[in-house]
């Protein structure tokens, strides 16, 4: 089948990095500067992505692969292939329509992105608060008051933070 296909379609012999040039009797021509073809048999080369403005070049375009972008310092990538850049905030903040705002009391964010999440409710698991929460850190739950017998000193990490609006499973 491959042999038949190549006899019928000379373009199928054109490798990645080239295109089948109809203007030159279907000769395989190299992709022009700032363009690429990542698969064989293509009749055109694709224009390379340009990482401009808030986007930085992570990987240069080549004749066989597109450029890859990331974001300038102070921003992070969003979307497939870093299609957008979103500004960072400080830990203890979240990004809102009004810019970076401190987490409300009872919530925290330990990253430069994402939303403030509620502190873990230790009492739901029958535990007590060992270390208070802050804007940047979740509470640390300790043993329940009943467990605080002589010699007992187990400390468990907090349960995974739940997203606001999601009830416990």
């Amino acid at each position: 089948f491959e042999r038949t296909r190549s006899l019928q379609d000379p373009c199928s012999n054109c490798p990645a990095g080239t295109f089948c040039d109809n203007n030159r009797n279907q000769i395989c021509s190299p992709c022009p500067p700032n363009s690429f073809s990542s698969a064989g048999g293509q009749r055109t080369c694709d224009i390379c992505r340009q990482c401009k403005g808030v986007f930085r070049t992570r990987k240069e375009c080549s004749s066989t692969s597109n450029a890859e972008c990331d974001c300038t310092p102070g921003f992070h990538c969003l979307g497939a292939g870093c299609s957008m850049c979103e500004q960072d905030c400080k830990q203890g903040q979240e990004l809102t329509k009004k810019g970076c705002k401190d987490c409300c009391f009872g919530t925290f964010n330990d990253q430069k992105r994402g939303i403030c999440r509620p502190w873990t409710n230790c009492s739901l698991d029958g535990k007590s608060v060992l270390v208070n929460g802050t804007k940047e850190r979740d509470v640390v739950c300790g043993p329940s008051p009943a467990d605080l017998s002589p010699g007992a000193s187990s400390v468990t990490p907090p349960a995974p933070a739940r997203e606001p609006g999601h009830s416990p499973q």
Partner: nanobody
Framework: EVQLVESGGGLVQPGGSLRLSCAAS????????MTWFRQAPGKGLEWVAH????????YYVDSVKGRFTISRDNAKNSLYLQMNSLRAEDTAVYYC????????????????WGQGTTVTVSS
């Protein structure tokens, strides 16, 4: 080609005013939130203001509230930043940027960026 081109920057004395413009082309301007950022010499990029698709919502960084006004003219595919009572600390390159799809609902990511226009506030 999707493009944003800023203009209107220049040298102005403290207390003076400037109006920046951003001409958009190659996309449906009225379908996107639009944003102004700035970068002072030796500093990182700072968000300044943004405006909803129809102009009904506008938000500003605290340092420019009451002095700067963001606006848009969807018929002219243009974004503006009126800058009054300018201070030395407003000296920066100002960039307009397009909010990506879903902006303000699920994220505040921008996907298209202008080349910038320089504002210098000095006596």
């Amino acid at each position: 080609e999707v493009q944003l081109v800023e203009s209107g920057g220049g040298l102005v004395q403290p207390g003076g005013s400037l109006r920046l413009s951003c001409a958009a082309s190659g996309f449906t301007f009225s379908s996107h939130w639009m944003t102004w950022f700035r970068q002072a010499p030796g500093k990182g990029l700072e968000w300044v203001a943004h405006i909803k698709e129809d102009g009904s919502e506008k938000y500003y960084v605290d340092s420019v509230k009451g002095r700067f006004t963001i606006s848009r003219d969807n018929a002219k595919n243009s974004l503006y930043l009126q800058m009054n009572s300018l201070r030395a600390e407003d000296t920066a390159v100002y960039y307009c940027a397009r909010g990506g799809e879903g902006y303000s609902d699920s994220h505040f990511g921008v996907d298209v960026w202008g080349q910038g226009t320089t504002v210098t506030v000095s006596s």
